[in-house]
Amino acid sequence: FNISGCSTKKLLWTYSTRSEEEFVLFCDLPEPQKSHFCHRNRLSPKQVPEHLPFMGSNDLSDVQWYQQPSNGDPLEDIRKSYPHIIQDKCTLHFLTPGVNNSGSYICRPKMIKSPYDVACCVKMILEVKPQTNASCEYSASHKQDLLLGSTGSISCPSLSCQSDAQSPAVTWYKNGKLLSVERSNRIVVDEVYDYHQGTYVCDYTQSDTVSSWTVRAVVQVRTIVGDTKLKPDILDPVEDTLEVELGKPLTISCKARFGFERVFNPVIKWYIKDSDLEWEVSVPEAKSIKSTLKDEIIERNIILEKVTQRDLRRKFVCFVQNSIGNTTQSVQLKEKRG
């Protein structure tokens, strides 16, 4: 199709080489009242379109994205050619940063309902640059945490070094929805709820004498509880003795609950005590079996191919630790009678 009639938007993505970062493009198809093309440029004021303008339909999930190759080749369907770019409804998600994402991206409705819809399309010219060292050293992260139940804020990474007074007007989106009243480089969240978790996008306009473009940054916001003040507790084993059959295989499970920590480095391991000696046992990897906002339950098993007489004289100790402290639970094996 002919893309000369598409509206054009220029965007800049300046990514940090130090952090993982995502980016999004919205299919900003023109609203009827703002449109300089689609229906309005085809109809005289007296004419009435026989179809609602595309944006009259709230369903923007039916859009098609293309990339325009720089060599003038035909448009390429994004879904077929770019595995690191994901389409979610009307949004295009770039999962990895890199200058190779630079280029022209075009979106338009999948369903062309009328001849007027042909020019209902947007061309986005995306320029991707790595952040220079000269940029602000303490810019806000692209991953920000909000503490549930308290007051917090979300900062626009590309503007976080500027004071509120000198900051340009910012346009914010949350999960693709425009937050029309938020216009500053920092959103204040009076009280944090689960609702505030999501993908936030901040845009502002930068201009030079020749043209203007939108500088965009994406922030992944996570709602968290405060760091635990407790050391982990062992849920299993509960008993300090375990009846076993000699010569049979045995698996002893250690399950421990770790409270939430922003920097989470849980330790769960098994060691064996035999008279004055003790050594750590090589056991299968620990696995998370339940994770909630407040805590995580982690399990690690010790596997004995067959229980021997020697094992009955040993103590099997599960050791768990977080930044607050550690807990142990020992198990003595006892031969099953009868």
Partner: antibody
Framework: EVQLEESGGDLVQPGGSLRLSCAAS?????????MCWVRQAPGKGLEWVAC?????????YYASWAKGRFTISRDNSKNTLYLQMNSLRAEDTAVYFC????????????WGQGTLVTVSS | DIQMTQSPSSLSASVGDRVTITCQAS??????LAWYQQKPGQAPKLLIY???TLASGVPSRFSGSGSGTDFTLTISSLQPEDFATYYC?????????????FGGGTKVVIK
């Protein structure tokens, strides 16, 4: 008993100023509430004026027409909400209600009985 | 500011009638909408919050529905005490749950 009581309503000349107060009892301002002002002109509908967050951020929110002329504030130690109204006009004549917005629902679950402000020469 | 448009501005109905009032927001407010009832000389009373949740002590004949920009308040069988003015209100402002713009109101009068 949990209640809100407005005071300070009066007859004032156009261009004049007035400060309304709202005393809260039965709950603490420092809790996470939005304390707000809503007005109702005689025979007309409800109109949102402004809100202030009673928690630590103290964020303030205004209807676009109220920005610049009206200022909302609070004194948590006195459990009192204020509305400072300047450059008053005849169209500001209304009953001014104090209301409390709660939690993650954002609705007004508690209202005062209102105080009448009349702007006339 | 968000604009809330309520319709009709008034309606006449009889006891036992099913009454429907609609409210449209100028932008997507998800399900953050409240409905109030106001009688002459009284402060408004909360009926419904979060678009469809009945406030404490409100009779079950009142119900709310909708999300995004279009919302409805329904009174399944109008009672004599229901003749009053009803208002919708947006209860989200950016990312904060700030009660803000009201609709123009719907006056329910006896036919």
């Amino acid at each position: 008993e949990v209640q809100l009581e407005e005071s300070g309503g009066d007859l004032v000349q156009p261009g004049g100023s007035l400060r309304l107060s709202c005393a809260a009892s039965g709950f603490s301002f420092s809790s996470s509430y939005y304390m707000c002002w809503v007005r109702q002109a005689p025979g007309k509908g409800l109109e949102w004026v402004a809100c202030i967050y009673a928690g630590s951020s103290g964020s303030t929110y205004y209807a676009s027409w109220a920005k610049g002329r009206f200022t909302i504030s609070r004194d948590n130690s006195k459990n009192t909400l204020y509305l400072q109204m300047n450059s008053l006009r005849a169209e500001d004549t209304a009953v001014y209600f104090c209301a409390r917005g709660a939690g993650s629902n954002g609705d007004f679950n508690l209202w005062g009985q209102g105080t009448l402000v009349t702007v006339s020469s | 500011d968000i604009q809330m448009t309520q319709s009709p501005s008034s309606l006449s109905a009889s006891v036992g009638d099913r009454v429907t009032i609609t409210c449209q927001a100028s932008e997507d407010i998800e399900s953050y909408l409240a409905w109030y009832q106001q009688k002459p000389g009284q402060a408004p009373k909360l009926l419904i919050y979060r678009a469809s949740t009945l406030a404490s002590g409100v009779p079950s004949r009142f119900s709310g529905s909708g999300s995004g920009t279009d919302f409805t308040l329904t009174i399944s069988s109008l009672q004599p005490e229901d003749f009053a003015t009803y208002y919708c209100q947006s209860t989200i402002y950016g990312v904060n749950f700030v009660p803000n713009a009201f609709g123009g109101g719907t006056k329910v009068v006896i036919k």
